[in-house]
Interface confidence: medium
C-alpha cells in the first residue's frame, strides 16, 4: 500500500508523542497548582486537538483556539505579570525563584505548549509528524504561531497594575516591534487596568556599563506605551547572574549595591 500523499512544509514536524506530552503536562500542572485542581485535562486536550486537527494548517484562526482559551482561564494577581522578549530562559529562571510572578509559560496554556510544535492536515484526523508550516517560508497563520498570538493577547489583556517586561540588551533591536511582545502584547495591555510598564533591560557583557534604557528602540517602546496612557519605566540589569542571586537572597550585603 502506497503511503497517502502528504503536504510538505518547510518547518519541523509535530513534536513526537505530542498528545501524550500535552496530557501529561496538564495533569502535572493541575497537581502542582491547587487553584487549577479541578481542571479536566481530557477536555483540555480535546479542545487543543479541535483547534488544528482536520484543518488546513495555513488557515488557522484565533477563533479556532477560543474553546481552549476558555478552558484555560486563569488570572494573575495585579503587579505579578512578567512579559519577556528574546530572553525566555532568564525570565523563566526568575519566576522559578520569584514564585509570585508569572510568565505566560507559568500559566496552564503556556506550560502545555512551551517548546512544542504541532499541526494537522486538512480533512484527516491525523497529526503531521513529518513537517509543519514555517512562519517565514510557508505561512503565518499556522497552528503554533496562531496559538502563541492568541494566548499572548489574552495574557496581556488580563494583566493589571505594574506589568514587567524582560528585554535582551545584547540584541541589535532590544525592543523589536515584530516580536510577540512588540506586535501583540504591547498593544493589548489595557490602560484602564495597567498603571505602568517597567522594562528590565538585561545586559550581556560583564563590562557593559552603558545605559541601554537610552537605546532608540527603548525610546520607541516608551513612545508607544505613553501614547496608550500607560506610564513607562526602565531599569538596566547590568549583572543578570547577580540579579538572580539577589532575588534568591535579598539580604546578601552585595545586593544593596546596584545590579
Amino acid at each position: 500500500v502506497l503511503p497517502r500523499w502528504r503536504q510538505q512544509w518547510s518547518g519541523s514536524g509535530t513534536t513526537s508523542r505530542f498528545p501524550e506530552t500535552v496530557l501529561a503536562r496538564c495533569v502535572k500542572y493541575t497537581e502542582v497548582h491547587p487553584e487549577m485542581r479541578h481542571v479536566d485535562c481530557q477536555s483540555v486536550w480535546d479542545a487543543f486537538k479541535g483547534a488544528f486537527i482536520s484543518k488546513y494548517p495555513c488557515n488557522i484562526t484565533e477563533e479556532d483556539y477560543q474553546p481552549l482559551v476558555k478552558l484555560g482561564t486563569q488570572t494573575v494577581p495585579c503587579n505579578k505579570t512578567l512579559l519577556w522578549s528574546r530572553i525566555k530562559d532568564l525570565a523563566h529562571q526568575f519566576t522559578q525563584v520569584q514564585r509570585d510572578m508569572f510568565t505566560l509559560e507559568d500559566m496552564l496554556l503556556g506550560y502545555l505548549a512551551d517548546d512544542l510544535t504541532w499541526c494537522g492536515e486538512f480533512n484527516t484526523f491525523e497529526i503531521n509528524y513529518q513537517s509543519c508550516p514555517d512562519w517565514r517560508k510557508d505561512c503565518s497563520n499556522n497552528p503554533v504561531s496562531v496559538f502563541w498570538k492568541t494566548v499572548s493577547r489574552r495574557f496581556a489583556e488580563t494583566a493589571c497594575g505594574v506589568v514587567h517586561v524582560m528585554l535582551n540588551g545584547s540584541r541589535s533591536k532590544i525592543f523589536d516591534k515584530n516580536s510577540t511582545f512588540g506586535s501583540v502584547e504591547v498593544h493589548n495591555l489595557q490602560p484602564e487596568k495597567v498603571q505602568a510598564l517597567e522594562a528590565w533591560v538585561i545586559h550581556g557583557g560583564r563590562e557593559d556599563s552603558r545605559d541601554l534604557c537610552q537605546d532608540p528602540t527603548i525610546k520607541e517602546l516608551e513612545s508607544i506605551i505613553s501614547k496608550r496612557n500607560i506610564r513607562f519605566f526602565c531599569k538596566n540589569i547590568y549583572r543578570p547572574d547577580k540579579f538572580l542571586q539577589c532575588v534568591k537572597n535579598p539580604e546578601d550585603s552585595s545586593c544593596l549595591s546596584g545590579i
Partner: antibody
C-alpha cells in the same frame, strides 16, 4: 477516623455577627483545602467559600463576599467562618467539607461535617 | 437560580435504571471535573462520584457518572429503596471563580 465537627450555630438578629467553628480530626489538616457550604431550609446546597491549606488564599461566593471571612488555625486543627451583617437569607445549615488530595488527584468535598444551624 | 441545571425530581421502581442529568457551560462542566453528592433525608451530603466517573471506596458500582461537553449525568442501576435521596452535581467555575452546584434532584423509589 476522619471527622469534621461544626459548632457555633444559633439564633442571631439581622445585622448581627456569629462565628462558626469546624474541628477536624483523623487527617493532615495543614494540607487540606477546606470549604463552607450552606443549605437553606428545604433548598439546595450553596457553596460559601474555600480556604487553602496554609490560610493564605480564600475564595467566596458573591452572596457573602465582604460579610463573611474564612480563616483557620492549623495548630488547633480548626476552621472558622466569621459571619457579620447577617441577613434573613443567611438562615441555613452550615457544613464544613474537606477538599482532599489523594494519590495526586483531588477529590472535592469528600468528607462533610454534620452541620450547624444558623437562624437569622 | 443555580448555575448548573438538574431536573427537580426523578423516580423509578426497584431494580430499574435511573439517569439524572446536569447541564452547565464551557467555564464549568466542560472545563472541570464533575462531582456528584447524595444527601439522604436529614443527613449531610456524601461524595458519590468524583472526577466525572470515579467512585470513592464504599460506593456501590450501581452508581456511575459520565460527562460529555457541557453536560454530565449520574446513572443508578438496580435501584434500591435506600437510594431515595437528593442528588447534587457540582464543579468549579473558572469564570465566576466559585464552586457551583446544581439545584438538586429528588429521587423517589416507587
Amino acid at each position: 477516623e476522619v471527622q469534621l465537627l461544626e459548632s457555633g450555630g444559633g439564633f442571631v438578629q439581622p445585622g448581627g455577627s456569629l462565628r462558626l467553628s469546624c474541628a477536624a480530626s483523623g487527617f493532615n489538616f495543614n494540607n487540606a483545602w477546606m470549604n463552607w457550604v450552606r443549605q437553606a431550609p428545604g433548598k439546595g446546597l450553596e457553596w460559601v467559600g474555600i480556604i487553602n491549606g496554609d490560610g493564605t488564599n480564600t475564595y467566596y461566593a458573591d452572596s457573602v463576599k465582604g460579610r463573611f471571612t474564612i480563616s483557620r488555625d492549623n495548630s488547633k486543627n480548626t476552621l472558622y467562618l466569621q459571619m457579620s451583617s447577617l441577613r434573613a437569607e443567611d438562615t441555613a445549615i452550615y457544613y464544613c467539607a474537606r477538599d482532599n488530595k489523594l494519590n495526586d488527584y483531588y477529590y472535592a468535598m469528600d468528607v462533610w461535617g454534620q452541620g450547624t444551624t444558623v437562624t437569622v | 437560580q443555580s448555575v448548573l441545571t438538574q431536573p427537580s425530581s426523578a423516580s423509578g421502581t426497584p431494580g430499574q435504571r435511573v439517569t439524572i442529568s446536569c447541564s452547565g457551560g464551557s467555564s464549568n462542566i466542560h472545563a472541570n471535573y464533575v462531582y456528584w453528592y447524595q444527601q439522604l433525608p436529614g443527613t449531610a451530603p456524601k461524595l458519590l462520584i468524583y472526577r466525572n466517573s470515579q467512585r470513592p471506596s464504599g460506593v456501590p458500582d450501581r452508581f456511575s457518572g459520565s460527562k460529555s461537553g457541557t453536560s454530565a449525568s449520574l446513572a443508578i442501576s438496580g435501584l434500591q429503596s435506600e437510594d431515595e435521596a437528593d442528588y447534587y452535581c457540582g464543579t468549579w467555575d473558572n469564570i465566576l471563580n466559585v464552586w457551583v452546584f446544581g439545584g438538586g434532584t429528588k429521587l423517589t423509589v416507587l
